[in-house]
């Protein structure tokens, strides 16, 4: 089945991550967050892993998370890193491999019977403890889409947009992530001018809905860079 293949280690001959294989003609040689680049060799294994730059976890694979490669490194330089297995140290849920989540700084198994209660506890902890964070990282009080049986409604805690019902996306709200409505035409949106700026928002907006893109509002072209208003507009 689809589930079993995705969760197995059956795929051994993975091409390198975006950026292409060394010496592979026609491969892309650079990558930018938000863009998939083709390239690679069918026979190359994951041992030849090349880092993929990212701004948020959603840009990485399901078995990866987005972070600075060096401890205490420049937050502006982030790449997709391999997820942490059970009993490994973590700072947020996305760091743990599918089927696990981050509890008290350690990746633990997502026991479906106890999971929701513990997630709710974690939220209470982080809000009740002066928004404290672990190792300077905000806690990601969310859970893997694999844990859900029903899609989250507006306001539900989430890990990724696939956890949310149709018309909603998973966006940061304080030190958690919740399902929020996808933006409609004319609504104000956020255009990230530099990589990693997503991390500065504690009230993250959803992306623009299908057929819309986040562009400068026409009558704001003359305004200064910092005050330019972006809205969702038809392509």
């Amino acid at each position: 089945t689809l589930n079993s293949v995705l969760n197995s280690n059956a795929i051994k001959n993975l091409p390198p991550p975006l950026g292409g294989a060394a010496g592979h003609p026609g491969s892309a040689v650079s990558a930018a967050p938000g863009i998939l680049y083709p390239g690679g060799n069918k026979y190359q294994t994951i041992d030849n892993y090349q880092p993929y730059p990212c701004a948020e976890d959603e840009e990485c694979g399901t078995d990866e998370y987005c972070a600075s490669p060096t401890r205490g490194g420049d937050a502006g330089v982030q790449i997709c890193l391999a997820c942490r297995k059970r009993r490994k140290r973590c700072m947020r849920h996305a760091m743990c491999c599918p089927g696990n989540y981050c509890k008290n700084g350690i990746c633990v198994s997502s026991d479906q019977n106890h999971f929701r209660g513990e997630i709710e506890e974690t939220i209470t902890e982080s809000f009740g403890n002066d928004h404290s964070t672990l190792d300077g990282y905000s806690r990601r009080t969310t859970l893997s889409s694999k844990m859900y049986h029903t899609k989250g409604q507006e306001g539900s805690v989430c890990l990724r947009s696939s956890d949310c019902a149709s018309g909603l996306c998973c966006a940061r709200h304080f030190w958690s992530k919740i399902c929020k409505p996808v933006l409609k035409e004319g609504q104000v949106c956020t255009k990230h001018r530099r990589k990693g700026s997503h991390g500065l928002e504690i009230f993250q907006r959803c992306y623009c809905g299908e057929g819309l893109s986040c562009r400068i509002q026409k009558d704001h072209h003359q305004a200064s860079n910092s005050s330019r208003l972006h809205t969702c507009q038809r392509h």
Epitope: L2, L14, P17, L36, P38, C54, E56, E59
Partner: nanobody, 125 residues
């Protein structure tokens, strides 16, 4: 076993638009890369566009950039391909395919494990 079903193909005049849908059975759809491939008569199958599990990463072939838009709705187990400003050279059978998105990169054609039957798109001049 996952099944992918494409719909939305048809005959359209040059400059027109079509929207293809790819509906999947299988609860792990939200963990996959979805790609749209096309094959014109006498030509090799080519990757047109792809989207990662979350929709945060996309890829477009140079020939369709600015005209085609890929999107997905994981709640509906569906991916979409909006095709605008269609040209006669876009005429082909369009296939939807899905594969594991464990690592951030584009899959090679060989790694797309599930394929639809294809839908014909014909652009007349």
């Amino acid at each position: 076993e996952v099944q992918l079903v494409e719909s939305g193909g048809g005959l359209v005049q040059a400059g027109g638009s079509l929207r293809l849908s790819c509906t999947a059975s299988g609860s792990a759809f939200s963990s996959t890369v979805v790609g749209w491939f096309r094959q014109a008569p006498g030509k090799e199958r080519e990757l047109v566009t792809a989207i990662n599990w979350s929709g945060a990463r996309t890829y477009y072939a140079d020939s369709v950039k600015g005209r085609f838009t890929i999107s997905r709705d994981n709640a509906r187990n569906t991916a979409y391909l909006q095709m605008n400003s269609l040209k006669p050279e876009d005429t082909a059978v369009y296939y939807c395919a899905a594969g594991s998105d464990r690592y951030a990169r584009v899959l090679t054609e060989y790694e797309y494990m599930w394929w639809g039957q294809g839908t014909q798109v014909t652009v007349s001049s």
